[in-house]
Amino acid sequence: GPVWRKHYITYRINNYTPDMNREDVDYAIRKAFQVWSNVTPLKFSKINTGMADILVVFARGAHGDFHAFDGKGGILAHAFGPGSGIGGDAHFDEDEFWTTHSGGTNLFLTAVHEIGHSLGLGHSSDPKAVMFPTYKYVDINTFRLSADDIRGIQSLYGDPKENQRLPNPDNSEPALCDPNLSFDAVTTVGNKIFFFKDRFFWLKVSERPKTSVNLISSLWPTLPSGIEAAYEIEARNQVFLFKDDKYWLISNLRPEPNYPKSIHSFGFPNFVKKIDAAVFNPRFYRTYFFVDNQYWRYDERRQMMDPGYPKLITKNFQGIGPKIDAVFYSKNKYYYFFQGSNQFEYDFLLQRITKTLKSNSWFGC
């Protein structure tokens, strides 16, 4: 069955049952997630707006899925396995009387069970397991997962020792096949493509389906996370990496000494504080720097900006912009522009978009 392909998972409580104080609901749900994070590398974070991985909903009767609730008793709740959209979401029947104790239906105990489903667990045949299909109150102060529950969840995600590789949520590996995935910077490096995101980069070797994820610091310990733009001059075996108003030069995959340097050495005006994206075109021997809704063109031979810039992205790259996240050059005729979770193959000879893709389409998602 499906699992979350990341260790940092968000949840949001869509609405609150009137049966309990909001603080008690928050606490019960938080503690229920904690039960599973205690025995896995998973980290859960509550968000209050936007799209969470797991949406917690209190609803009665028909509520937008195929599985209408049945009034008091019977089905107490249900949850969907990991995935986008409704995937992971946990629904609690508002016709139950939700409580913090043994009266009514205990929200914490029910939530532990449902979150198990949200993480990809099925039902257990062990009556002592929290994933056993029927509800039975146990003292929540002494509650523990059964050996069967732990075995089940660790077969999906491993044990918490794996957290030592990812010490905090910011370090969490983004889900490569998340349809909403965006990238900070993308560049070719020889026959490889580097995709940068937060502290990570994915390495795609041309024409091979396999990709690997790495920490930037594992390859280049002196470089920061959050690379914002990157480009390659393959003939010189050089890669330029940008963050804020600084850039680093990598030669033959090794960081050059005496870097970082200021981006203003390229000739940007003082108001430019960071580069969104950059790409070198070897046919023209020019680098295009994208900043907000504009771009500059830099002559790599003469080491100076071309006159007449900046220009509007939308004016000269039909269908692209107003801003972009990343871009790289490939196959002698295409730029691949990244905007959020979308990617545009742009033929710079025809000067038009020839294909629209998801940003992660390179990974066989």
Epitope: H63, D65, F66, F80, S84, G85
Partner: antibody, heavy 122, light 103 residues
């Protein structure tokens, strides 16, 4: 490549029976919920029935409950719809559609077959 | 049962136009709404799921928004291939469809 291919449609008299099949390929069939959705000529889409990956859970629209039976044979990667006591209003193109993996159906139909036409007429 | 009301039922527009189709649920369905495109004689195609997520391979001129009871599908700049019928859907309920025709 995910593919769904329906067959078994045809002309049948009111009160008659028909069995539709949907052959699936390109994915692990037994993991996925699968559904039948129909479309009467010139009309909109109407969900008919759905079945979980294991076959243990089935659902029906009120308009077909008691007359239609959904089933699947995971060893043959095939979905079925047994239609009995057919009526003129059951005339439609019947599509099979793939849903998500998991214990519950999302009703998220990401892949569809081309459809097979069922005509109920005397 | 939840009802889905889609409007308008038909719409004439020109290439390059921005078009919006709306769908209203009779009660909250959170973000559990999908949009499909169907061309004559073809099977429906999933465009948007979970109200606002673009299905892989669908052009970015399509976008969805909304939550609770009110949802919209927007095509930012109509292309010739976009003339079709569009359906909203949640679980077993489809909207009645919006036929988008060339003006």
């Amino acid at each position: 490549e995910v593919q769904l291919l329906e067959s078994g449609g045809g002309l049948v008299q009111p009160g008659g029976s028909l069995r539709l099949s949907c052959a699936a390929s390109g994915f692990t069939f037994s993991d996925y919920w699968t559904h039948w959705v129909r479309q009467a000529p010139g009309k909109g889409l109407e969900w008919v029935s759905g079945i979980s990956g294991s076959g243990g859970m089935t659902m029906y629209a009120d308009s077909v409950k008691g007359r239609f039976t959904i089933s699947r044979d995971n060893s043959k990667n095939t979905l079925y719809l047994q239609m009995n006591s057919l009526r003129a209003e059951d005339t439609a193109v019947y599509y099979c559609a793939r849903d998500i993996v998991g214990p519950y159906s999302a009703g998220l139909f990401d892949y569809w077959g081309r459809g097979t036409l069922v005509t109920v007429s005397s | 049962d939840i009802q889905m009301t889609q409007s308008p039922s038909s719409l004439s527009a020109s290439v390059g136009d921005r078009v919006t189709i709306t769908c209203r649920a009779s009660q909250s369905i959170y973000t559990y709404l999908n949009w499909y495109q169907q061309k004559p004689g073809k099977a429906p195609k999933l465009l948007i799921y979970a109200a606002s997520s673009l299905q892989s391979g669908v052009p970015s001129r399509f976008s969805g928004s909304g939550s609770g009871t009110d949802f919209t599908l927007t095509i930012s700049s109509l292309q010739p291939e976009d003339f079709a019928t569009y359906y909203c859907q949640q679980a077993g309920i489809f909207g009645q469809g919006t036929k988008l025709e060339i003006k």
